[in-house]
């Protein structure tokens, strides 16, 4: 967990934790199915989710001057995306398989967003779309596109968290 | 394994409330939508609706809307089905299932709705 | 709604014979982007919930004998027991998950003759 009341989390376990999600990212990706996406236009649903930029302060300059700024939008991409693969895109018709790591990269989504909460301390997350139920033919999509978008996230912050770990550790 | 597992048989009075209970075992419950389905007598089957656990999110059949209320305690891996204003064509067989296409069911509740 | 509609109603066939059963949906359940199907077959015994046959209007699910067949792709659809037995006595129904509301068809009888 985050040093109590500190502006550092435990870069070493976010950077375990971060390169766990990578792999469970990509694993999970081909396992919602092959899809066509010529004819696809995209989906209100993954139109807003959250990118880390330039002005987030996740260069090696901004985390050495203050790394909140860029772990707050971390943690609210983190939130975002638990909150997603808990849906109904996720939880309903076609079902996922049983050993789907979907399960698994849920779990560590919010294992990592807690790492990274400093105690008594509470980020404004970013909104949640209101997601109204999505009709099964749609999923399979919505699936596809966002764990697309999930691991180009978690591939940033992974490399967030190892450079945290090589420079900015006590 | 998995296993949903629906509370007795219910005989209520036309206008009253019923609520049906689905205690779910065997897998993770907020990883998974639950849906109602129900069956009258001699008839076919009927979709009533959905929750995700996960979030208390429903999808209700318009049919149904206004009159039935899905909810989950994810506490103790349960879900229910409250449905208002009964009237004797309510007279059903009310079932719980996890997902469709991986075909578990509840044993099944009958709702005996008469005056 | 999709409308799902079985035929025929009932069916009496020989024990060893083939059972064919349709099922015709009011819109496709075709989804293009993976070529699938948003279709299952169900049996049901007396006093039992239905049991999942086939899903993906073609996927047998693991447990159901190899006798149970579904093929079909659009709005045509068929279940096939390829050699009827004494235990397949029940009702069949197909059913649509492709939108909601979920609507499933009125049910086939199947006997022996």
């Known amino acids: 967990r985050a040093v109590p009341g500190g502006s550092s989390p435990a870069w070493t376990q976010c950077q375990q934790l971060s390169q766990k999600l990578c792999t469970l990212a990509w694993s999970a990706h081909p396992l919602v199915g092959h899809m066509d996406l010529r004819e696809e236009g995209d989906e209100e649903t993954t139109n807003d989710v959250p990118h880390i930029q330039c002005g987030d302060g996740c260069d090696p300059q901004g985390l050495r001057d203050n790394s909140q700024f860029c772990l707050q939008r971390i943690h609210q991409g983190l939130i975002f995306y638990e909150k997603l693969l808990g849906s109904d895109i996720f939880t309903g018709e076609p079902s996922l398989l049983p050993d789907s790591p979907v399960g698994q990269l849920h779990a560590s989504l919010l294992g990592l967003s807690q790492l990274l909460q400093p105690e008594g301390h509470h980020w404004e997350t970013q909104q949640i779309p209101s997601l109204s139920p999505s009709q099964p033919w749609q999923r399979l999509l919505l699936r596809f596109k966002i764990l697309r978008s999930l691991q180009a996230f978690v591939a940033v912050a992974a490399r967030v968290f190892a450079h945290g770990a090589a420079t900015l550790s006590p | 394994q998995v296993q949903l597992v629906q509370s007795g048989a219910e005989v209520k009075k036309p206008g009253a409330s019923v609520k049906v209970s689905c205690k779910a075992s065997?897998?993770?419950?907020?990883?998974?939508?639950m849906h109602w389905v129900r069956q009258a007598p001699g008839q076919g089957l009927e979709w009533m609706g959905y929750?995700?656990?996960?979030?208390?999110?429903?999808n209700y059949n318009e049919k149904f809307k206004g009159r039935v209320t899905m909810t989950t305690d994810t506490s103790t891996s349960t879900a229910y089905m409250e449905l208002r204003s009964l009237r004797s064509d309510d007279t059903a067989v009310y079932y719980c299932?996890?997902?469709?296409?991986?075909?578990?069911w509840g044993q099944g509740t009958l709702v005996t709705v008469s005056s | 709604d999709i409308v799902m509609t079985q035929s025929p109603d009932s069916l009496a066939v020989s024990l060893g014979e083939r059972a064919t059963i349709n099922c015709k949906s009011s819109?496709?359940?075709?989804?293009?982007?993976?070529?699938?199907?948003?279709l299952a077959w169900y049996q049901q015994k007396p006093g039992q919930p239905p049991k999942l046959l086939i899903y993906?209007?073609?996927t047998r699910e693991s447990g159901v004998p190899d006798r149970f067949s579904g093929s079909g792709s659009g709005t045509d659809f068929t279940l096939t027991i390829s050699s009827l037995q004494a235990e397949d006595v029940a009702v069949y129904y197909c059913?649509?998950?492709?939108?909601?509301?979920?609507?499933f068809g009125q049910g086939t009888k199947v006997e022996i003759k």
């Open positions: 993906w209007a073609s």
């Open positions: 299932a996890r997902n469709w296409d991986v075909g578990y």
């Open positions: 059913q649509q998950y492709y939108s909601y509301p979920f609507t």
């Open positions: 819109q496709s359940l075709l989804y293009s982007s993976n070529q699938k199907n948003f």
């Open positions: 929750i995700n656990p996960y979030n208390a999110g429903t």
């Open positions: 065997g897998y993770t419950f907020t990883s998974y939508v």
